[in-house]
C-alpha cells in the first residue's frame, strides 16, 4: 500500500493488502477500502465501468466477468487499485471484439485472462492457419494482447487469443482485425479531358477520378475564383481492400458562354493534396480560322512544284472542304487532316499539291470550307515564273526594228549592235519606245513587251541582236544588216540562243 | 453496460448547420469507434461516417463529405457530428451507434427538423 | 458503393411462423454482414454479425447465413415482440450500406 509523509493527503488502502487477488468462480469477492475521505469504489474491464458509493465492495458470487481492476478514490482525487481474477476454467478469457488497428501503430487484442497462472498466452490464427510471419506482439493477462506496428496486410486477419490451461490448449472467440491504412501519398487526381469547347447550350460534362487506399478520401469539384457549390455525382469501386476509385462528374447540362472557365478538381487526404484542372470554352456560335501556312502571294518558277497549305480552326468540325482554281473544284492533288489524333482537337490541315507547274497555270487558288455554323476561304494568288520568249521580231516599213517578248516576271528587252563578224555585241542600243503590251489584261499571265529601235542609226555592216531576260533566263534574237551602195538590206533575221535559252526562229 | 446518450432535438433553418453529441458511458471510449447513422422520416439507414477516438480521424461516406465533421472528445467520452449547409432532405433522425463496422450500442437518436 | 437489397419489403406472419427474410450484395463481401430489428421510434438492435454470430442477449430463435452476396436471417418461431422492421448492412467495404428493410408484420 502507497505510504506518504504526514500531514500530506494520503491514497486510500485496501483490504486486502494486495497488488492482485485470485478469487474462484462462485466464490465472494469482498475489498474494503480504508479512508476518512473515501469518495467511491469504480471497476473496468473491457467496455464496462461500474461505481459503488459503499467502502466496502461485496461480490457474493463472483463471475468471470467480475475479473478486473478494483480502484478505490477519496476526496483528495487519491486512489489504489487492487486487481482481481475470478478464475472460471469454462470462461478463460473475457473478450471486446472489437479489433481495429491503425497502419504502423500498434493495437490491443483485448482478451485479458481470468486466470493468471495459465501458461502460453499468445495469438493464433484462426481455423489453425499461422500468423504473418512478421506479426509480433506481446502479452499482458490483464489488458489483452497487444500486436506490434499493425501492417496493411494484416488486414481482415482472423485470430484467437489462446493459452495453456491444464495442459491443454484454449482459444477465445475470433478476432477479425480492421486495419485502417496510412495515407503515405497524396491522392492520384486525372480529368476526362483536359479543355472543352461548346456552343451555347450544350451540355458540359467532365469527370474526375480519384485514387487514394480508402473511401476516405476527399474529393471536390471548385470552378477557379468562385466559392459556389458544383453539383457532381459519384461512382465509386474497391479494387481490393487498399485501393479505392472514386468518379466524380461534374455536369452543367445548357452551358452558357459565363460558364467559360477553369474548373479544378480538388482531392485531399492526411498526406497532403492534389489537384488537376480542365478548361471550358463556351462559345456563342461556332467558328472557322484559316491560317495559311505560306505566304498567299505565291512564285514558282515553270514546271516546278508548289504545295498550297493551310492551317485552320473548326468549331464544330468540319464538313465540306474544297480548293477550287478558275471555278473547277479539284477532285484529288489535295488532303486535307486533322493536326493531332487528340480528342479536343480543332485544328485540321490542308495542303494542295501543284506539280509541273506551267506559266498558263498561274492564277488564284480558293481553299473553302464549312461547318454546321459557317462559312471560310483563303484564296493563293500563284504566279509562274517563264523565261521569256521572243514572240516576234520584225523590221517595220518605217525603219523600226521591233522585239516582242513574252515571259514572268516582265521581261526586260536590251539591244545590242555588233559591227561586220563580231559574235559577242556588247555596243547597246537605247530603245525609242518600249510598251508593256497586256499590263491591264488578265492578271497571273505572261506580261508581254514590245521595244522598238530605230533602224536608220546603223551605218555598216553587222549583227543587231535584242535580248529578252527576266529572273528566270535570257532569250536573244540577231537580225543581220549588208549594206548594197547607200541601202541598208536586212540579209537574214534569225534568233540564237544561249543553251538556258529558249529556241525561236524568225525568218 | 454501455450506453451513449445523445443530445436534444433541433429545428434548424436551411443553410444552417447542427451540431449533436454522443455520450458515452459505461465503457472505455476511446479504443472503440464511433459512428453516426441517419435515417429520414419513413425511410432507411443511412451511414454518415464514424471515428476511431484513439486514431484520431474519422472515414465519411462520400455523399456527407465536405458538408460533415465528426470529432470525439476523449476526456468528456463525448463524440460530436456536426452537418452544416442544412438543406429540408437532411430531416432526419441522427443516431450515434458504436463500431465502425457493424454497431452494437445505438444511442436513442436526435431529431433534426431544417424548416424555413 | 456496394448495394444491398433486401426482399421481400414486406411480409405478413403469425406467431409461430417462421420467417426468412434475404439480402443479397451487389459484390463479394465474404461474411461482413450485419441484421439489426427496429421497432417504431426506436433506434435498431445488433442481432447477428460476420453474417451468422449471434449477438450477445439476442434469442436464440434468430439466425443467420450465407457467404460471398446471398445471405439470410431467419427466424425460427416469430414472437409477437418479433414484429418490426429488419435492415441488412455490409461492412466490408466503407463505406457502409444498408438494405432497405424488411417489415415484418402480423397476418
Known amino acids: 500500500q502507497p505510504s506518504v509523509s504526514p500531514g500530506e493527503p494520503s491514497p486510500p488502502s485496501i483490504h486486502p493488502a494486495k497488488s492482485e487477488l485470485i478469487v474462484r468462480v462462485g466464490n465472494e469477492i469482498r475489498l474494503l477500502c480504508i479512508d476518512p475521505g473515501f469518495v467511491k469504489w469504480t471497476f473496468e474491464i473491457l467496455d464496462e465501468t461500474n461505481e459503488n458509493k459503499q467502502n466496502e465492495w461485496i461480490t457474493e458470487k463472483a463471475e468471470a466477468t467480475n475479473t478486473g481492476k478494483y480502484t478505490c478514490t477519496n476526496k483528495h482525487g487519491l486512489s489504489s487499485s487492487i486487481y482481481v481474477f475470478v478464475r472460471d476454467p469454462a470462461k478463460l478469457f473475457l473478450v471486446d471484439r472489437s479489433l481495429y488497428g491503425k497502419e504502423d501503430n500498434d493495437t490491443l487484442v483485448r482478451c485479458p485472462l481470468t486466470d493468471p497462472e495459465v501458461t502460453s498466452y499468445s495469438l493464433k490464427g484462426c481455423q489453425g492457419k499461422p500468423l504473418p510471419k512478421d506479426l509480433r506482439f506481446v502479452p499482458d493477462p490483464k489488458a489483452g494482447i497487444t500486436i506490434k506496428s499493425v501492417k496493411r496486410a494484416y488486414h481482415r486477419l482472423c485470430l484467437h487469443c489462446s493459452a495453456d490451461q491444464e495442459g491443454k490448449s484454449v482459444l477465445s472467440d475470433k478476432f477479425i482485425l480492421k486495419v485502417r491504412p496510412a495515407f503515405k501519398a497524396v491522392p492520384v487526381v486525372s480529368v476526362s479531358k483536359a479543355s472543352y469547347l461548346l456552343r451555347e447550350g450544350e451540355e458540359f460534362t467532365v469527370t474526375c477520378t480519384i485514387k487514394d487506399v480508402s473511401s476516405s478520401v476527399y474529393s471536390t469539384w471548385k470552378r477557379e475564383n468562385s466559392q459556389t457549390k458544383l453539383q457532381e455525382k459519384y461512382n465509386s469501386w474497391h479494387h481490393g481492400d487498399f485501393n479505392y476509385e472514386r468518379q466524380a462528374t461534374l455536369t452543367i447540362s445548357s452551358a452558357r458562354v459565363n460558364d467559360s472557365g477553369v474548373f479544378m478538381c480538388y482531392a485531399n487526404n492526411t498526406f497532403g493534396s492534389a489537384n488537376v484542372t480542365t478548361t471550358l470554352e463556351v462559345v456563342d456560335k461556332g467558328f472557322i480560322n484559316i491560317f495559311p501556312m505560306i505566304n498567299t502571294t505565291v512564285f514558282v518558277n515553270d514546271g516546278e512544284n508548289v504545295d498550297l497549305i493551310v492551317e485552320y480552326e473548326a468549331f464544330p468540325k468540319p464538313e465540306h472542304q474544297q480548293w477550287i482554281y478558275m471555278n473547277r473544284t479539284f477532285t484529288d492533288k489535295w488532303e486535307d487532316y486533322p493536326k493531332s489524333e487528340n480528342e479536343s482537337n480543332i485544328r485540321y490541315v490542308s495542303e494542295l499539291h501543284l506539280t509541273r507547274l506551267k506559266g498558263t497555270e498561274g492564277g488564284t487558288y480558293t481553299f473553302l470550307v464549312s461547318n454546321s455554323d459557317v462559312n471560310a476561304s483563303i484564296a493563293f494568288n500563284v504566279y509562274v515564273n517563264t523565261k521569256p520568249e521572243i514572240l516576234t521580231y520584225d523590221r517595220l516599213v518605217n525603219g523600226m526594228l521591233q522585239c516582242v517578248a513574252a515571259g514572268f516576271p516582265e521581261p526586260t528587252i536590251d539591244w545590242y549592235f555588233c559591227p561586220g563578224t563580231e559574235q559577242r555585241c556588247s555596243a547597246s542600243v537605247l530603245p525609242v519606245d518600249v510598251q508593256t503590251l497586256n499590263a491591264s489584261g488578265p492578271p497571273f499571265g505572261k506580261l508581254v513587251v514590245q521595244s522598238s529601235i530605230d533602224s536608220s542609226a546603223f551605218k555598216h555592216n553587222g549583227t543587231v541582236e535584242c535580248k529578252a531576260y527576266n529572273d528566270v533566263g535570257k532569250t536573244s534574237a540577231y537580225f543581220n544588216f549588208a549594206f548594197k551602195g547607200n541601202n541598208k538590206e536586212q540579209i537574214h533575221p534569225h534568233t540564237l540562243f544561249t543553251p538556258r535559252s529558249h529556241h525561236h526562229h524568225h525568218h | 453496460q454501455v450506453q451513449l446518450v445523445q443530445s436534444g432535438a433541433e429545428v434548424k433553418k436551411p443553410g444552417s448547420s447542427v451540431k449533436v453529441s454522443c455520450k458515452a458511458s459505461?465503457?472505455?471510449?476511446?479504443?472503440?469507434?464511433l459512428s453516426w447513422v441517419r435515417q429520414a422520416p419513413g425511410q432507411g439507414l443511412e451511414w454518415m461516417g464514424g471515428i476511431i477516438p484513439s486514431f484520431g480521424t474519422a472515414d465519411y461516406a462520400q455523399k456527407f463529405q465536405g458538408r460533415v465533421t465528426i470529432t470525439a472528445d476523449e476526456s468528456t467520452s463525448t463524440a460530436y457530428m456536426e452537418l452544416s449547409s442544412l438543406r429540408s432532405e437532411d430531416t432526419a433522425v441522427y443516431y450515434c451507434a458504436r463500431g465502425l463496422y457493424d454497431f452494437d450500442y445505438w444511442g436513442q437518436g436526435t431529431l433534426v427538423t431544417v424548416s424555413s | 458503393d456496394i448495394q444491398m437489397t433486401q426482399s421481400p419489403s414486406s411480409l405478413s406472419a403469425s406467431v409461430g411462423d417462421r420467417v426468412t427474410i434475404t439480402c443479397r450484395a451487389s459484390?463479394?463481401?465474404?461474411?461482413?454482414l450485419a441484421w439489426y430489428q427496429q421497432k417504431p421510434g426506436k433506434a435498431p438492435k445488433l442481432l447477428i454479425y460476420?453474417?451468422?454470430s449471434l449477438q450477445s442477449g439476442v434469442p436464440s430463435r434468430f439466425s443467420g447465413s450465407g457467404s460471398g452476396t446471398d445471405f439470410t436471417l431467419t427466424i425460427s418461431s416469430l414472437q409477437p415482440e418479433d414484429f418490426a422492421v429488419y435492415y441488412c448492412q455490409q461492412y466490408y467495404y466503407l463505406p457502409s450500406t444498408f438494405g432497405q428493410g424488411t417489415k415484418v408484420e402480423i397476418k
Open positions: 459505461g465503457g472505455t471510449f476511446s479504443s472503440h469507434a
Open positions: 460476420d453474417a451468422s
Open positions: 459484390q463479394d463481401i465474404s461474411q461482413d
